[in-house]
């Protein structure tokens, strides 16, 4: 059987000769060389090689238990003579041994880190690690202690962990920023003789809102003429604030002072400056001076740092009014009036008030732009400003009048205002209802007494434009002797009815009836229109043969009823729209 | 159905006044002139006041110009006649009827008493 | 003003007689007239306009007729529902004014 133990060699050896590593021995060799041993397996005949008549196994290079810890390898007894085995194949390991030949070595060689300004002490920064390619196994080759080589009194770093912390109370952003920190790693758990490595920690602290913001002065001035419109630009202030980004953020308002209504400051958020705005109208005349208290805040506050004091400063910002020389200013932006159509001229409609604005207040005259009432319907009284008709109104022609009167500074022609002017013209029950249309209809020869022939509308100009109340009777001069009757259908249509049985066209081939059409309006207006009733002869069906002597010419298919219009079509000479009559025989 | 209802009269002191009102239903109110009628007790009918339909047009008998004010809220479909300076003459019934010139409806009328 | 006058101021007359009532003008007022009749403690009811148009509703047996300055009402058979008060009120000029009246009674 085999005799041997497991063999262990040292890494990186030096020495000048191959590196005995052990022997390999049968209990079958009596020395008398007729054995033969062979090695088989990881590195034989390269890094291993056996004395085939000894067994004896030496390493011929240097071995690196980092590259590979272990090698497994077979061996062999044969007899020489037959080449037969003596003894079963073997594996056998050959184990290398640990040195300490490796540093620790950091996975990076440059960290960046981050930590607030005025952090806590202790507050985590970064943590590095560094690794040792040591057996870890094995004595203290790949132990790893962390220390501080650079960095201190403001950084610590954990031995065991690699944890870098903050060391230092109320490190200060605005006073330094950038640090640098070595560390070193050492194996053998530090101890003399350990090997090391070091890494470089960058580490910047990050801005905390430690810092108010600060008006550089007390006091602005500023001075905006009297006629600068709302929004309009005043001037800039600035607070300056030692933080960065958002903790250096500043808001801008108006806090005390008499123009806080009358002025606004906002925030350029590219310059963080505060703009003083105007908010409303300035006027000279009433307010030359203004002074505001405008405070400079930060938004964003940290709780914890407040027992610093108010994270904001104020300053007094003293704004100038110019007077400027302004225009007259009416007293209504604009004016609507009303008037009745039936107003006679002259009557007074109202009137406009407008006055310098200025200290001097100058007096001011009053005109109507004429490009704007070009058929002078209205006039104004150049010193008041009352408005006067100077023409006769008619609603039905013109229901609204929109004219400008002009304000002018009498000292100073050049200062002139505008208003405009809305005039009503309200509605007078002055036109009377008419026809509809023009009505010329016809009757039968043999139509009998009562039958509708003709049916009336009127139309009237006045309002009501939803609807009036028409009243439709025969003049008083027709009623008593008229062969129609008018049947007032209260809807605002009337009838017109035969009143006889049978007409004879050649006693009278036309008839004229005067209508008399009323509204039922105040004062009560009426006209009196004519229809014109013809008397045709008709066949027994009730279609038109002749009309007053005429060939009559139809429209193939039409005919009349006793109920229906008949209408004569302006254009066409003689040809009547006809209906079915109803016979009554 | 047309109906017109008077509400606002009774007693009142001369030189007082008082604000009559007429609500109006079943016809469109804003295409009518609408009118005041009085009757004083035992009298004839005596013509007040008109005015027309969109209420740009107001008209007074000459016994009330100056005292009384006719007018009208079309989108509440009521009239109203409001009464100053009443005298003991113009103590009466007093009717709303639609219509401008001839009142084919008229309400059943309010009692003005003016007296001391 | 127009003063409107009627005549008689009162009649007595029994159902089923034909009465006619008549109104004068001052001054012409064209066909611009109404009637209207009142029972004790209604309000008036329109009757006639424009001289001779009947109003919707009423009997047939009221006519009117008449222009210029004389006018007449005619009750072609009186009925017992017909006795009250009539009126005329003229509507052709402002102020619009009313008759007296007239009062119809039965015999």
């Known amino acids: 059987s085999w005799m041997w133990n497991q063999f262990f060699l040292l890494e990186e050896y030096t020495g000048s000769d191959y590196q005995y590593v052990g022997k390999l021995h049968s209990d079958q060799d009596r020395g008398d060389g007729s054995l033969k041993y062979i090695l088989s397996g990881d590195g034989a005949g390269d890094l291993f090689i056996i004395n085939e008549n000894t067994g004896d196994i030496q390493a011929t290079k240097r071995l690196d238990r980092e590259e590979k810890p272990v090698y497994i390898l077979r061996a062999q007894a044969v007899n020489r003579r037959t080449g037969r085995p003596v003894e079963p194949e073997s594996e056998f390991i050959i184990k290398i041994h640990d040195i300490n030949d490796n540093e620790p070595i950091f996975t990076k060689d440059v960290y960046t880190a981050t930590v607030p300004e005025m952090a806590d002490v202790g507050t985590f920064v970064v943590q590095v690690t560094a690794t040792d390619a040591d057996d870890p196994t094995y004595g203290n080759s790949a132990k790893v202690v962390y220390s501080i080589l650079q960095g201190q009194p403001y950084f610590s770093v954990e031995s065991e962990t690699g944890i870098i912390k903050t060391a230092l109370l109320n490190m200060d952003r605005e006073n330094r920023e950038q640090y640098q920190v070595v560390i070193q790693a050492k194996d053998m758990g530090g101890q003399m003789g350990g090997l090391s490595g070091t890494t470089t920690v960058n580490i910047t602290l990050t801005d905390v809102n430690d810092n108010p913001p600060r008006f550089p002065q007390s006091t602005y001035q500023f001075k905006t003429p009297e006629s600068s419109p709302p929004g309009t630009p005043i001037g800039r202030i600035k607070a300056s604030d030692a933080d960065v980004g958002e903790n250096a953020e500043i808001e801008y308002s108006i806090t005390d002072g008499e123009g806080h209504e009358m002025f606004d400051v906002i925030t350029d958020q590219e310059t963080q400056e505060g703009i003083i705005t105007v908010k409303k109208l300035l006027d000279f005349e009433k307010k030359k001076v203004y002074t505001l208290k405008v405070e400079a805040s930060n938004p964003h506050v940290e709780p914890r740092f407040l027992y610093l004091g108010p994270f904001k400063d104020s300053a007094t910002v003293r704004i100038v009014v110019d007077d400027v020389d302004e225009p007259p200013v009416f007293s209504k932006l604009a004016y609507i009036l009303q008037i009745r159509e039936d107003a006679r001229i002259n009557t007074t409609i109202g009137s406009v008030a407008a006055q310098d604005p200025d200290a001097a207040r100058n007096p001011v005259k009053y005109s109507v732009d004429r490009h704007t009432d070009m058929d002078r319907i209205f006039n104004i009284d150049s010193g008041n400003g009352s408005i006067f008709t100077s023409k006769l109104l008619d609603r039905e022609t013109l229901l609204w009048h929109n004219i400008t009167v002009i304000a002018t500074e009498i000292n100073n022609p050049k200062q002139s205002s505008r208003v405009p002017l809305y005039i009503k013209v309200l509605d007078v029950n002055d036109n009377a209802p008419e026809f509809a249309e023009f009505y010329e209809t016809f009757v039968c020869e043999k139509a009998k007494a009562d039958q509708l022939i003709q049916t009336l509308r009127a139309v009237d100009k006045d309002d009501p434009y939803s609807g009036h109340q028409f009243s439709f009777s025969l003049a008083p001069e027709a009623a008593s002797s008229s062969n129609f009757t008018i049947q007032d259908n209260k809807d605002n249509t009337a009838g017109i009815l035969t009143r006889k049985n049978g007409y004879n066209r050649h006693e009278m081939s036309t008839y004229l009836l005067p209508v008399v059409i009323s509204d039922n309006d105040y004062p009560v207006q009426s006209s009196t229109g004519t229809v014109t009733v013809r008397v045709c002869a008709c066949d027994h069906h009730g279609n038109m043969q002749s009309c007053h002597a005429e060939a009559l010419i139809h429209p193939t298919g039409l005919s009349t009823g006793a109920g229906s219009e008949f209408r004569h079509d302006s254009g066409l000479n003689d040809i009547f729209e006809a209906q079915k009559i109803e016979w009554h025989e | 159905q047309v109906q017109l209802l008077e509400s606002g009269g009774g007693l009142v002191q001369p030189g007082g006044s008082l604000r009559l009102s007429c609500a109006a239903s079943?016809?469109?109110?804003?295409?009518?002139?609408m009118s005041w009628v009085r009757q004083a007790p035992g009298k004839g009918l005596e013509w007040v006041s008109v005015?027309?339909?969109?209420?740009?047009?107001?008209y007074y008998a000459d016994s009330v110009k100056g005292r009384f004010t006719i007018s009208r809220d079309n989108s509440k479909n009521t009239l109203y006649l409001q009464m100053n300076s009443l005298r003991a003459e113009d103590t009466a019934v007093y009717y709303c009827?639609?219509?401008?010139?001839?009142?084919?409806?008229w309400g059943q009328g309010t009692l003005v008493t003016v007296s001391s | 003003d127009i003063q409107m006058t009627q005549s008689p101021s009162s009649l007595s007359a029994s159902v089923g007689d034909r009465v006619t009532i008549t109104c004068r003008a001052s001054?012409?007022?064209?066909?611009?007239l109404n009637w209207y009749q009142q029972k004790p403690g209604k309000a008036p009811k329109l009757l006639i306009y424009?001289?001779?148009t009947l109003q919707s509703g009423v009997p047939s047996r009221f006519s009117g007729s008449g222009s210029g300055t004389d006018f007449t009402l005619t009750i072609s058979s009186l009925q017992p529902e017909d006795f009250a008060t009539y009126y005329c009120?003229?509507?052709?000029?402002?102020?619009?004014?009313f008759g007296q009246g007239t009062k119809v009674e039965i015999k």
């Open positions: 009827a639609r219509g401008g010139g001839y009142f084919d409806y």
């Open positions: 079943g016809f469109t109110f804003s295409s009518y002139a």
């Open positions: 005015i027309r339909s969109s209420g740009s047009s107001t």
């Open positions: 001054q012409s007022i064209s066909l611009w």
């Open positions: 424009a001289a001779s």
């Open positions: 009120q003229q509507y052709y000029t402002s102020p619009y004014t």
